[in-house]
């Protein structure tokens, strides 16, 4: 009678296994941000160092009465959730508590910032192996907070920050909103997202995945052999700070890029009902429950990929949305999306030295988001070619004309306002493998690439009849790196990847004025990386 | 995942009303004051003032006593709380918002930021 | 109905090691909702918690005896067994098993000892 | 640790009267307190749990009452039988017993 928590995201195989680092020691450290923590707990006795640091704010309230456990109370669940010797995820990982909370779950953004602040330096003075930091807290949106977060993630430290509990946009607060950190939002026993009171777990783009967040069972600090169940994102955070824990334990040189893509990648997939979110949030939040992943000596070598959507470009004439990739990640292709179509398209750019996803919004349209495909490719060397766009009635033809180089997506930028004149872009599988063609007044850009192992090849998928989306999906082994949409109606609302599948979505108006002959196709490149091959282009 | 969320940015590049220090003088703020859009939320009083990436250590503490300095001619008393040096440069001052001006004219400052609250979830 | 039995040697000399063993009838160690502990009783005194041990291995001493002591469960046998090394006269007592709510599984109970076993005097004498 | 202090030592009384047993900690257990029973030659069995729960088949003469660090154990009508050695046991932190009070026949 194993704690349904603890089911769900440890997989039978893993159950009795025991992590540790191939030296046969567990050097993995976690270091908890969160209120005061009772240490002699049975669950975490031990394993816990109360460190000196304390940053809090006064508890509000002149008849606040400061009673040691209910300071203790959320610090210590999360603590016996992390590294918990009967309910915990990663059993007797050691974990460092700083207290950035006080008695009444608050504290500052200062107090935050000055407890990070405090890990670098113990990083500086006594290295040690890989360190974790959960940071089951949440304020407004802070672009000191996410700065400090991009600044530790950069010397290593694995970030794992709950998303909130306001039943609102993840990119609203920090650290939630920070790229660098691992967001994950709570769901529940039935894998739904977890409702708290009138609120619940946040949701959308930020959110990197989900875990148990609901009637969690683990340490109380009422007394040293109590439990109790809490509930929120602190908690599905620290399921997964523990699952983060156990892979650094296996695999201690593990990346941050590598173990944010192993945990989608593991994780389980489309069992949460997105229709709990707002209509506008749920093609951008991840139908993703956090698992426990094989370790990478049982999984080989395998092209990993995840997709990466831009903030919302606004409704301006002129408004590009920029979507970026973790720079150990290479930019595999672009795509956008605007939910009115009127879209001008996207491309990739270099800023800064980092390839850079684009999408620019058309007149009229209420705003667009860029799609990037980022994936994790070892020994990589991947270029953009680009055409400008081509006379009115011509093709434009961009393949890769670097040899060993493979064709990993596509992009197509009008240069042309009126929706109406131009013809859509398309791929070709077949007379022209490997490239990307665009119709007129499109620009065309081709990603291509060059790993040892890397092949790739087009799959599309097209429907004549009415239909608001259409969809081909990578088989097994496969990975999707582009997805395209190739119209036969003026209007698509543009493309992206969720998962494997390649999602082509139409315009309402369109698909009803849509002959038979007009198919709207989805294009797939599908890629895998069979390290002992050379690179090709499979037709 | 980007840089700005729902959030107040708040330019105060306010003209230079100094007493006539040629340094001051010269310098108009192109650093942004930056808050909580949520009200109840906020800390008035506290910010974190933060300085460009290559701030050198010995350039964060003068730029901090420079604050404190001008502050006092000012009849301002502020209080340093903190010094951040090693994950990003900057320091946490206890001061008025009077003085906000005045800051975000400092060199090496590229933005102030209200402290605020976070809460366990 | 759950029962328990304590055996193992009723003398040990000072500075030996006093080994016990508790078998447990009617019920599974294995059980995520139970740890397995054992209390003792010196002769006419009260009694003392030496500690407890949970299938998975997890084990909770008392600190005044943490140094000296060993708890393990074997699940094979369906038995767990104390170890207490370098014993002193001061060791004499009663040794008792006990069995006591983990807490992980809220439905299993309240979180204390019972039942327990019958008990086992050991004398530490040379 | 926590100290668990129990009064009397002995008390002394007849079948069919009121027993009052006190047990009180050095620092507040809330309400994580117990009391077990021993006759000679037997292991404890507990009686009450969490301060007042009766545990399975314990008579309703059995009650427990207080919070914090002031407890109560109370037979209100005490049978040949319930003429034994109690003691209290608290789990807040760790867990520690209290010397034990004998109830014997007057």
């Known amino acids: 009678s194993i704690p349904w928590n603890l089911e769900r995201i440890i997989p039978a195989w893993h159950q009795t296994e025991e992590d540790r680092s191939p030296d046969g020691s567990s050097q993995v450290e976690v270091y908890l941000l969160d209120t005061s923590i009772q240490g002699a707990h049975r669950e975490i006795e031990g394993r816990v160092t109360i460190t000196d640091f304390n940053s809090v704010p006064e508890e509000d309230g002149t008849r606040f009465h400061r009673q040691a456990s209910k300071c203790d109370s959320h610090g210590t669940h999360l603590a016996g959730v992390v590294s918990g010797r009967d309910a915990g995820v990663a059993k007797g990982t050691s974990l460092h508590s700083l207290r950035v909370l006080n008695c009444q779950g608050k504290g500052t953004v200062s107090g935050t910032l000055i407890g990070l602040e405090f890990i670098r330096k113990s990083q500086l003075i006594q290295p040690s192996g890989p360190l974790v930091v959960l940071l089951p807290l949440a304020g407004g949106y802070s672009r000191i907070l996410n700065a400090a977060c991009r600044h530790l993630a950069r010397t290593g430290v694995v970030l794992v920050a709950a998303a909130g509990n306001f039943r609102d946009d993840a990119c609203l607060y920090s650290p939630a909103s920070a790229p660098e950190v691992i967001t994950v939002g709570a769901t529940n026993a039935q894998d739904q997202p977890v409702t708290l009171g009138t609120l619940g777990t946040n949701f959308g783009r930020c959110v990197d995945l989900f875990a148990p967040g609901k009637d969690i069972i683990g340490a109380s600090s009422d007394c040293s052999t109590c439990f109790m169940s809490q509930s929120g994102t602190s908690q599905a955070a620290a399921h997964v700070a523990g699952i983060v824990a156990r892979m650094l334990s296996r695999e201690p040189t593990l990346t941050l890029a590598e173990l944010r893509q192993r945990l989608i990648h593991f994780s389980t997939k489309d069992v949460i009902n997105m229709a709990w979110f707002p209509e506008d949030q749920q093609v951008l939040t991840p139908n993703l429950v956090a698992t426990l992943p094989p370790s990478t000596h049982e999984t080989g070598g395998q092209l990993l990929c995840r997709t990466v959507w831009s903030a919302h470009s606004g409704p301006t004439r002129t408004a590009t949305a920029t979507a970026r990739c973790a720079p150990e990640e290479e930019l595999l292709s672009c795509s956008s999306f605007s939910r009115s179509g009127r879209r001008r398209g996207d491309w990739i750019e270099a800023i800064g030295g980092q390839q850079v996803c684009k999408a620019l919004n058309a007149f009229g349209g209420e705003g667009v988001y860029a799609v990037a495909r980022c994936c994790l490719v070892p020994r990589a060397n991947c270029s953009i070619h680009n055409t400008p766009a081509a006379r009115a009635g011509l093709e434009t033809h961009v393949h890769c004309h670097q040899k060993d180089h493979v064709l990993t997506g596509c992009s197509f930028h009008w240069e042309v306002e009126d929706l109406s004149v131009r013809r859509q872009p398309a791929l070709r599988s077949r007379r022209q493998p490997g490239q990307c063609v665009g119709h007129q007044a499109a620009s065309v850009y081709a990603s291509c690439c060059h790993a040892p192992g890397l092949e790739c090849k087009i799959k599309e998928h097209g429907i004549s009849g009415p239909s608001e989306q259409v969809t081909v999906a990578c088989e097994a082994g496969w990975t999707l790196t582009g997805c395209n949409v190739l119209p036969g109606a003026s209007l698509t609302l543009g493309a992206y990847s969720v998962d494997n599948l390649c999602v082509a979505r139409v315009h309402d108006t369109a698909r009803a004025d849509r002959t038979s002959g007009e198919a709207t196709v989805a294009a797939a490149i599908c890629c895998r990386s069979r390290p002992s091959a050379k690179a090709s282009w499979v037709q | 995942q980007d840089e700005d969320g729902d959030y107040e940015e708040l330019m105060l590049a306010l003209p230079s009303q100094e007493d006539g220090l040629a340094d001051e003088a010269a310098h108009v703020a192109t650093a942004t004051f930056r808050r909580c859009s949520k009200e109840a939320w906020r800390l008035p009083g506290t910010y974190i003032v933060v300085l460009m990436e290559e701030t050198q250590r010995l350039q964060i503490e003068q730029t901090a006593h420079r604050l404190q300095t001008r502050a006092a001619r000012r009849g301002y008393v502020i209080k340093v709380l903190h010094i951040f040096y090693d994950l990003f440069p900057g320091f946490l001052v206890k001061m008025s918002s009077d003085l906000l001006g005045l800051a975000l004219k400092l060199p090496h400052v590229e933005y102030i930021e209200e402290d605020s609250f976070v809460f366990a979830q | 109905q759950l029962q328990l039995q304590e055996s193992g040697p009723g003398l040990v000399k000072p500075s030996e090691t006093l080994s016990l063993t508790c078998t447990v009838s009617g019920g599974s160690v294995s059980s995520s909702s139970y740890y397995w502990g054992w209390i003792r009783q010196p002769p006419g005194k009260g009694l003392e918690w030496i500690g407890s041990a949970y299938y998975s291995g997890s084990t909770y001493y008392n600190p005044s005896l943490k140094s000296r002591v060993t708890i393990s469960v074997d699940t094979s046998k369906n038995q767990f067994s104390l170890k207490l090394s370098s014993v002193t006269a001061a060791d004499t007592a009663v040794y008792y098993c006990?069995?006591?709510?983990?807490?992980?599984?809220?439905?299993?109970?309240?979180?204390?000892?019972?039942?327990w076993g019958q008990g086992t005097l050991v004398t530490v004498s040379s | 640790e926590i100290v668990l202090t129990q009064s009397p030592a002995t008390l002394s009384l007849s079948p069919g009267e009121r027993a009052t047993l006190s047990c009180r900690a050095s620092q507040s257990v809330s309400s994580y307190l117990a009391w077990y029973q021993q006759k000679p030659g037997q292991a404890p069995r507990l009686l009450i749990y969490d301060a007042s729960n009766r545990a399975t088949g314990i008579p309703a003469r059995f009650s427990g009452s207080g919070s914090g660090t002031d407890f109560t154990l109370t037979i209100s009508s005490l049978e040949p039988e319930d003429f034994a050695v109690y003691y209290c046991?608290?789990?807040?932190?760790?867990?520690?017993f209290g010397g034990g009070t004998k109830v014997e026949i007057k």
């Open positions: 046991q608290q789990r807040r932190n760790w867990f520690t």
């Open positions: 006990a069995r006591e709510n983990s807490g992980v599984v809220p439905a299993a109970g309240p979180n204390w000892f019972d039942p």
